[in-house]
């Protein structure tokens, strides 16, 4: 499956939008840093089948969409930027869904890669729990925004590696 050229452009736009969502100086939030235990092994493609990688990437973007489309995120972050971010993520999801169907068929893919998908879901559960515990403070959102930028960058790197293998 060939992801369209607009897909990588969309990735870059999503990262730029995340960067623009900054509301306060991160320098004031150092004490709020937290280990979300990013599931790095799910992004190391040594043993990856392409279909598995696509399923993991799809889950990553879906969970990012879910995280940023809560009422708490709307209250904390710029709505115009959020709306643009949703559009980019929605396009990414559509591109990846087309790929999943081409690679393995829509039925079996979630079952085949259940462990990988579960690892991504648990990662986002930890992020949501952290936000709840921190009462969705400005610094908590700043830490989460930085974490999502990092995980998004790692997702982009995985997509680049998949493309170079074609």
């Amino acid at each position: 499956c060939d992801l369209p050229q607009t897909h990588s452009l969309g990735n870059r736009r999503a990262l730029i939008l995340l960067a623009q969502m900054r509301r306060i100086s991160p320098f004031s939030c150092l004490k709020d840093r937290h280990d979300f235990e990013f599931p790095q092994e799910e992004f190391d493609d040594k043993q990856f089948q392409k279909a598995q990688a696509i399923s993991v990437l799809h889950e990553m973007i879906q969970q990012t969409f879910n995280l940023f489309s809560t009422k708490d995120s709307s209250a904390a972050l710029d709505e115009t930027l959020l709306d643009e971010f949703y559009i980019e993520l929605d396009q990414q999801l559509n591109d990846l869904e087309s790929c999943v169907m081409q690679e393995v068929g829509v039925i079996e893919s979630p079952l085949m890669y259940e462990d990988s998908i579960l690892a991504v879901r648990k990662y986002f559960q930890r992020i949501t729990l952290y936000l709840t515990e921190k009462k969705y403070s400005s610094c908590a959102w700043e830490v989460v925004r930085a974490e999502i930028m990092r995980s998004f960058s790692l997702s982009i790197n995985l997509q680049k590696r998949l493309k170079s293998k074609e």
Partner: antibody, heavy 121, light 107 residues
Framework: EVQLVQSGAEVKKPGESLKISCKGS????????IGWVRQMPGKGLEWMGI????????AYSPSFQGQVTISADKSISTAYLQWSSLKASDTAMYYC??????????????WGQGTLVTVSS | DIQMTQSPSSLSASVGDRVTITCRAS??????LNWYQQKPGKAPKLLIY???SLQSGVPSRFSGSGSGTDFTLTISSLQPEDFATYYC?????????FGQGTKVEIK
């Protein structure tokens, strides 16, 4: 391979200006902050300040606020430390180091080789 | 600013000795404490981050412990290449601050 390469040693006179550099390579320059550390001859490490190259936001130690300026040019992956008017007491080794910002990763894991600044009349 | 106080400021030890350096913060810094090793004419090298995490490539004889205000760096069996100056540094809040250093010398 991650590298921070600093500009060469400088010999200056009191009152002169100076700008030293720190070029990052082997990683995404805007994903890490760059901090500056001073070490005067035979003395310990002193933290001077830091910059987020993604938007050039800076923070300084009170001891260095107004004495130096930290800047960055993300297009060439380079951070700078500058003085508008050097003093003899600025004679020291200056190091740059990268910091992961708010991400849970090792602090100041890579350092530049240092730039020796000598200020003498 | 948070003050970092290291002790001792210097110590003499022999190869094979167990060496302990302590660092105390003037207020709680959680686990946001790093340890660095510096040899003459060289840049500092990160040994331990977040109080107890061993930096990649650093020998396992180095270990760190503590949280809040009191921290310890331990070298379980001192090697010839370990003779250097060691610094603690807090990264809980800006401005970051270093301890004054502990010089480990050959007895």
């Amino acid at each position: 391979e991650v590298q921070l390469v600093q500009s060469g040693a400088e010999v200056k006179k009191p009152g002169e200006s100076l700008k030293i550099s720190c070029k990052g390579s082997g990683y995404s320059f805007t994903s890490y902050w760059i901090g500056w550390v001073r070490q005067m001859p035979g003395k310990g490490l002193e933290w001077m300040g830091i910059i987020d190259p993604s938007d050039s936001d800076t923070a300084y130690s009170p001891s260095f606020q107004g004495q130096v300026t930290i800047s960055a040019d993300k297009s060439i992956s380079t951070a700078y430390l500058q003085w508008s008017s050097l003093k003899a007491s600025d004679t020291a080794m200056y190091y740059c180091a990268r910091h992961p910002g708010l991400n849970w990763a090792p602090d100041f894991d890579y350092w530049g080789q240092g730039t020796l600044v000598t200020v003498s009349s | 600013d948070i003050q970092m106080t290291q002790s001792p400021s210097s110590l003499s030890a022999s190869v094979g000795d167990r060496v302990t350096i302590t660092c105390r913060a003037s207020q709680s810094i959680s686990k946001f404490l790093n340890w660095y090793q510096q040899k003459p004419g060289k840049a500092p090298k990160l040994l331990i981050y977040f109080a107890s995490s061993l930096q990649s490539g650093v020998p396992s004889r180095f270990s760190g412990s503590g949280s809040g205000t009191d921290f310890t760096l331990t070298i379980s069996s001192l090697q010839p290449e370990d003779f250097a100056t060691y610094y603690c540094q807090q990264s809980n809040t800006l401005p970051f601050t270093f301890g004054q250093g502990t010089k480990v010398e050959i007895k």
